[in-house]
Amino acid sequence: GSERTCCPVNWVEHERSCYWFSRSGKAWADADNYCRLEDAHLVVVTSWEEQKFVQHHIGPVNTWMGLHDQNGPWKWVDGTDYETGFKNWRPEQPDDWYGHGLGGGEDCAHFTDDGRWNDDVCQRPYRWVCETELDKASQEPPLL
């Protein structure tokens, strides 16, 4: 079958998910496409524990995550509910700032140098993190 029971080479396993950390930058949409071609998605942070894990691996570097509001409300790329889910915004963020002079506001979320989140111009070439879940069926104990 197509079940993934262990992480691909160069990916890091953590809590039944696999993570890949880029070392170069792309715009948010291009990073999103990159992850899709890896049969993954931009990282979706669902807990403080996952936040700490990702933060440990990326260090103090602006890094895209799978959260955006390009179509209005904030949405996670995998459909995880934003309103009821984990959040770790910097104070007074997101602010959809228009003062950057690049046109439009700020529609894509990234980890900042201290790990907390900020919204920024989606075209900025930041690093990114891909995530893919290990097959849930593989967590089931074998039938005896």
């Epitope: 197509s2 691909p8 170069s24 930058g25 792309k26 715009a27 949409a29 291009d30 496409n33 990159y34 899709r36 071609l37 890896e38 049969d39 070439p125």
Partner: antibody, heavy 117, light 107 residues
Framework: EVHLLESGGGLVQTGGSLRLSCAAS????????MTWVRQAPGKGLEWVSV????????FYADSVKGRFTISRDNSKNTLYLQMNSLRAEDTAVYYC??????????WGQGTLVTVSS | DIQMTQSPSSVSASVGDRVTITCRAS??????LAWYQQKPGKAPKLLIS???SLQSGVPSRFSGSGSGTDFTLAISSLQPEDFATYYC?????????FGQGTKVEIK
């Protein structure tokens, strides 16, 4: 050793259809996204399409969108390109290639598609 | 789409010469650039990825440099097997696009 072998090219009338295949060996096929790149006679390279390892994600060049369909059968280690509504400008050598970090690290020898009117 | 422009379109050189080919992107692609070599009737071969990373098995006389919009492929001492056409490719954004090619010919 990585090996990619295209087949299925040939002469077809304008408006006709053709299905190209690319047989892969020497690596874990399902772990890699695969692409098609074409080269018109005496011209440069043009990226056509890409498909993720599972087949669940696909992207196309605007020039072929709606006419070409990329697919794969991981049980057969084979990549496909279904080409419909062919035009004279689709005449080219079609290469399959393995995606490597958005680059193409291994290529097949190519198969020639000629669209005549 | 990102346009890639190579120059020159062809260059005549002798064995032992240093040859440089440039590639310009229509927008910033940071270091998402590859160089390929293609010989007549053959498939392209990846030489360099990420602007400057030499692929395994590629001779050290090949080198790549640049970032942003301007990139260079250099061949330090041209060998007989290096006469071919060279293409750059941007891997920053879909659709992935190639330069028009630079043919390195024997003088």
């Amino acid at each position: 050793e990585v090996h990619l072998l295209e087949s299925g090219g040939g002469l077809v009338q304008t408006g006709g259809s053709l299905r190209l295949s690319c047989a892969a060996s020497g690596f874990t096929f399902s772990s890699y996204a695969m692409t098609w790149v074409r080269q018109a006679p005496g011209k440069g390279l043009e990226w056509v399409s890409v498909i993720s390892g599972s087949g669940g994600n696909t992207f196309y060049a605007d020039s072929v969108k709606g006419r070409f369909t990329i697919s794969r059968d991981n049980s057969k280690n084979t990549l496909y390109l279904q080409m419909n509504s062919l035009r004279a400008e689709d005449t080219a050598v079609y290469y399959c290639a393995r995606r490597y970090g958005d680059y193409f690290d291994y290529w097949g020898q190519g198969t020639l598609v000629t669209v005549s009117s | 789409d990102i346009q890639m422009t190579q120059s020159p379109s062809s260059v005549s050189a002798s064995v032992g010469d240093r040859v440089t080919i440039t590639c310009r992107a229509s927008q910033d692609i940071t270091d998402w650039l590859a160089w390929y070599q293609q010989k007549p009737g053959k498939a392209p071969k990846l030489l360099i990825s990420a602007a400057s990373s030499l692929q395994s098995g590629v001779p050290s006389r090949f080198s790549g440099s640049g970032s942003g919009t301007d990139f260079t492929l250099a061949i330090s001492s041209l060998q007989p097997e290096d006469f071919a056409t060279y293409y750059c490719q941007q891997a920053n954004s879909l659709p992935w696009t190639f330069g028009q090619g630079t043919k390195v010919e024997i003088k």
